[in-house]
């Protein structure tokens, strides 16, 4: 049997026998275009493609539409994988989304959605989510039904304000909504009473900016 040389996600890599967490090269569906991603092969059985990570404020997340489309940062540290790749990938098969959160007091929580996909760019990468479980709130901190993605130069929210400019970062803003994991990074002791921080309302409430976040996806049938 021929060894598989291209992989569409980290689940395929895991199933091929490569089970060490790290940076791997993925290929866009139906294309030869490649992208580097961090694969988490340890959490909950492994095979997770990390699509977002925050940990120290080393990367500026107040980026343009093009940058959020194509991805930015370093897969070894803080990064955004890219809306176009995620949209194409999640449009092909059913994926689950796991969001892992850390606060400044040493607590961890997660939200798991049993179906996640992004619409195409023509629909502003609108987010679709169903089936929430987990410890980071019984109500979804990503507004339901899903919103369009907005950035500082592409305002697609439901607000008379520009949420991305007001709150910082590209996100699926409502008006503006209960979350923003791409907000301004605030260090410990400066992370409360912040309107534009890294917010997951139904876990930590208003004004609390989180220490670390990871968004990762995996096929539902993994």
């Amino acid at each position: 049997k021929e060894e598989q040389t291209t992989f569409r996600d980290c689940a395929e890599i895991f199933k091929s026998g490569l089970t060490t967490s790290g940076i791997y090269t993925l290929t866009f569906p139906n294309s030869t275009e490649e992208i580097k991603a961090y694969c988490d092969m340890d959490v909950g059985g492994g095979g997770w493609t990390v699509i977002q990570h925050r940990e120290d404020g080393s990367v500026d997340f107040q980026r343009t539409w093009k940058e959020y489309k194509e991805g930015f940062g370093s897969p070894l540290g803080e990064y955004w994988l890219g809306n176009e790749f995620v949209s194409q990938l999640t449009g092909q098969h059913r994926y689950v989304l796991k969001i892992q959160l850390k606060d400044w007091e040493g607590n961890e929580a997660h939200s798991l959605y049993d179906h996640f996909y992004l619409a195409g760019e023509e629909s502003n990468y609108r987010i679709h989510l169903t089936g929430l479980t987990g410890t980071a709130g019984k109500i979804s901190s990503i507004s339901q039904p899903g919103s369009d993605f907005s950035t500082k130069d592409s305002d697609n929210d439901k607000c008379i304000c520009k949420c991305s400019q007001m709150l910082s970062g590209g996100w699926w803003f409502d008006a503006c909504g209960p979350s923003n994991l791409n907000g301004q990074y605030y260090p410990q002791k400066q992370n409360t009473n912040k309107f534009n921080g890294i917010k997951w309302y139904y876990w930590k409430g208003s004004g609390y900016s989180l220490k670390a976040t990871t968004m990762m996806i995996r096929p539902a049938d993994f």
């Epitope: 304000c161 007001m166 209960p178 309107f195």
Partner: nanobody
Framework: EVQLVESGGGSVQAGGSLRLSCAAS????????IGWFRQAPGKEREGVSC????????NYADSVKGRFTISSDTAKNTVYLQMNSLKPEDTAVYYC???????????????????????????WGQGTQVTVSS
């Protein structure tokens, strides 16, 4: 630094009245909507009323409509919640909170409404206790 300080809470008999005050500082008052939320023991925090002094937009929870009135004094950077015909179920800690007035949908602006969704509010006071006995 943003500060919201509530006062005016206390104990009252059912049918009585109280006036809560929220003194705001650290931001341009006219640019913000001020909300009142409450939390009773063992219950979720709920929106009571809000006001945007720049355009007079207000909103009330169904449970307090016709009994509570919100108003603002821009000169004093203070918002008031006049509570009449109080009921035992109004017993709670009442919080004052603030959100930029522009953080609204066009539909809300057309309807002259402000947010009663607590997740939109960024800044919170420490709260004042209201106890209504029968």
């Amino acid at each position: 630094e943003v500060q919201l300080v509530e006062s005016g809470g206390g104990s009252v008999q059912a049918g009585g009245s109280l006036r809560l005050s929220c003194a705001a500082s650290g931001f341009t008052f006219d640019d913000y909507a001020i909300g009142w939320f409450r939390q009773a023991p063992g219950k979720e925090r709920e929106g009571v009323s809000c006001i945007s002094s720049s355009d007079g937009s207000t909103n009330y929870a169904d449970s307090v409509k016709g009994r509570f009135t919100i108003s603002s004094d821009t000169a004093k950077n203070t918002v008031y919640l006049q509570m009449n015909s109080l009921k035992p179920e109004d017993t709670a800690v009442y919080y004052c909170t603030a959100v930029p007035a522009t953080r609204r949908t066009p539909q809300m602006v057309d309807a002259n409404m402000c947010w009663l969704a607590e997740y939109e509010y960024d800044y919170w006071g420490q709260g004042t206790q209201v106890t209504v006995s029968s």
